[in-house]
């Protein structure tokens, strides 16, 4: 009897490591079978959407990463107040799971457009670099579905990198102009955003609580028009320490306002950055490692 | 023409109480925020107060915070200063002045307003 | 607070002498710096914005320059109606800061 007992045991452990190693392998076959589908990604050829099929829909990209999708690519998401899946780029780097909502990477899309494109969104949805603005109805539904972190990842001409993290991000709905709200600050870039930088200039400095301005939907607290000046759509102030929709520069630039991408806090107003990256992950993301 | 025009000068006792005016024309008043500045008899200027374009933001110099009030009437398109607990060192000529620009800048100026506090 | 220190507090110069007037912030201001005349018993006047900006209706022999913390007003050739006062003035943070002050006067 005992002996019976001690290899019911042993089968037992033989069973439950087969299971586990079964459950690596699937993790494994899925993640083959995503690379193999989208190896042309870093081929160069990426004019596609990674094709998930229908087996659910995913509310951001940290569900498609934990969901075992470890591969950084175009992929559909549709937020839970959203009325239509829409494509974004998720990168699954950086510990995964952060969905693109802007990027700036060479100048080729023009960001100087009007409020139903900023509303909708706009730009290149195919090409793993491509610029875009992801839409502030977009990132309302996004970001009212569970608290967010923002991460911006920045990079001058000369090769550095730097990056500026804000926990509660917040795009509020058309009723309010798409306003912005950032909580706790951190990183290496410096506080452009919420213009903590110097206690006295957050009057015409913070972007919190900013309305969205275009060139044809004028919300910001100066007499002037900010958009129309600076030739983007942002949360301008009077008008701003930090804009990463503004005209794209190659490093220092002189012009009539500081219309170039801008935050303030690492290259002031005079540097145009080269790269930008503007993404955002759950607050309590943790990774799915199974 | 842009004009600040401001109300009378004045003199006042020790701990007593008074609002100034400012009135604005020839620009629509309610998009640009305003302040006072002040300057004693010989001295050079100190600004005293702003008021955002909303009057949903004021800000004070630490010499008059607690004391001074800033407010405004965009549908008089005039602009306040309720001065409470004068002072001896309260005695200036007041100015109004329209915060202007990008870089906020002071354009243009009321004529000024002589307070005299003394007993 | 940021302090803006003038110099020279006072000058004395001739009709078409060229004028320097400096302004130091204690702190960066970028280029929120201005500056303004004042004539006695008057309200103070723009010259310039934003450091280096001629305000409209401005004469042109007065230019401005510099960014950060050292700033200079330059008058090229003083008229007569030049003789005043000139202040600096910080608009980089909201508790606003003039210089002290250069009175320039006829020699």
């Known amino acids: 009897l005992e002996d019976c007992a001690q290899e019911q045991m042993r089968l037992r452990a033989q069973v439950r490591l087969l299971e586990t190693r079964v459950k690596q392998q699937q993790v494994k076959i899925k993640q083959l079978l995503q690379e193999n589908e989208v190896q042309f990604l870093d081929k160069g050829d990426e004019n596609t959407v990674i094709d998930l099929g229908s087996k659910r829909q995913y509310a951001d990209c940290s569900e498609i990463f934990n969901d075992g999708y470890k591969l950084s690519g175009f992929y559909k998401i549709k937020p839970l107040q959203s009325p239509a899946e829409f494509s974004v780029y998720c990168d699954m780097s950086d510990g995964g799971g952060w969905t693109v909502i802007q990027r700036r990477s060479d100048g080729s899309e023009n960001f100087n457009r009007g409020w139903k494109d900023y509303e909708n969104g706009f730009g290149n949805f195919v090409q793993k670099h491509g610029e875009y603005w992801l839409g502030n109805k977009n990132l309302h539904f996004l970001t009212t579905q569970e608290d967010y972190t923002l991460k911006i990842d920045l990079a001058d001409f000369e090769k550095n990198s730097r990056y500026a993290q804000y926990k509660n991000f917040k795009v509020g709905d058309e009723k309010n102009f798409y306003e912005l709200n950032i909580g706790e600050y951190s990183g290496t870039a410096g506080d452009s955003l919420a213009g903590n930088f110097h206690p006295e200039v957050q009057w015409w400095a913070s972007h919190q609580r900013m309305k969205f301005s275009t060139w044809d939907r004028d919300h910001d607290n100066y007499e002037g028009n900010c958009a129309e000046e600076d030739q983007s759509g942002w949360w301008f102030n009077r008008c701003h320490s930090a804009n990463l929709n503004g005209v794209y520069y190659s490093g220092p630039y002189t012009a009539k306002t500081d219309n170039g991408i801008v935050w303030y806090t690492w290259h002031g107003w005079w540097y145009s950055l080269k790269s930008v990256v503007m993404k955002i992950r759950p607050n309590d993301f943790i990774p799915n490692v199974i | 023409e842009v004009q600040l025009v401001q109300s009378g000068g004045v003199v006042v006792q020790p701990g007593g109480s008074l609002r100034l005016s400012c009135a604005a024309s020839g620009f629509t008043f309610d998009d640009y925020a305003m302040h006072w500045v002040r300057q004693a008899p010989g001295k050079g200027l100190e600004w005293v107060s702003l008021i955002s374009w909303d009057g949903g933001s004021t800000y004070y110099a630490d010499s008059v915070k607690g004391r001074f009030t800033i407010s405004r009437d965009n549908s008089k398109n005039t602009l306040y200063l309720q001065m409470n607990s004068l002072r001896a060192e309260d005695t200036a000529v007041y100015y109004c002045?329209?915060?202007?620009?990008?870089?906020?800048?002071?354009?243009?100026w009321g004529q000024g307003t002589l307070v005299t506090v003394s007993s | 607070d940021i302090q803006l220190t003038q110099s020279p507090s006072s000058l004395s110069a001739s009709v078409g002498d060229r004028v320097t007037i400096t302004c130091r912030a204690s702190?960066?201001?970028?280029?929120?710096l201005n500056w303004y005349q004042q004539k006695p018993g008057k309200a103070p006047k723009l010259l310039i914005y934003?450091?280096?900006s001629l305000q409209s209706g401005v004469p042109s022999r007065f230019s401005g320059s510099g960014s950060g913390t050292d700033f200079t007003l330059t008058i090229s050739s003083l008229q007569p109606e030049d003789f005043a006062t000139y202040y600096c003035q910080q608009s980089y943070s909201t508790l606003w800061t003039f210089g002290q002050g250069t009175k320039v006067e006829i020699k």
């Open positions: 934003a450091a280096s």
């Open positions: 702190q960066s201001i970028s280029s929120y």
């Open positions: 002045a329209r915060n202007s620009g990008r870089r906020n800048w002071f354009d243009p």
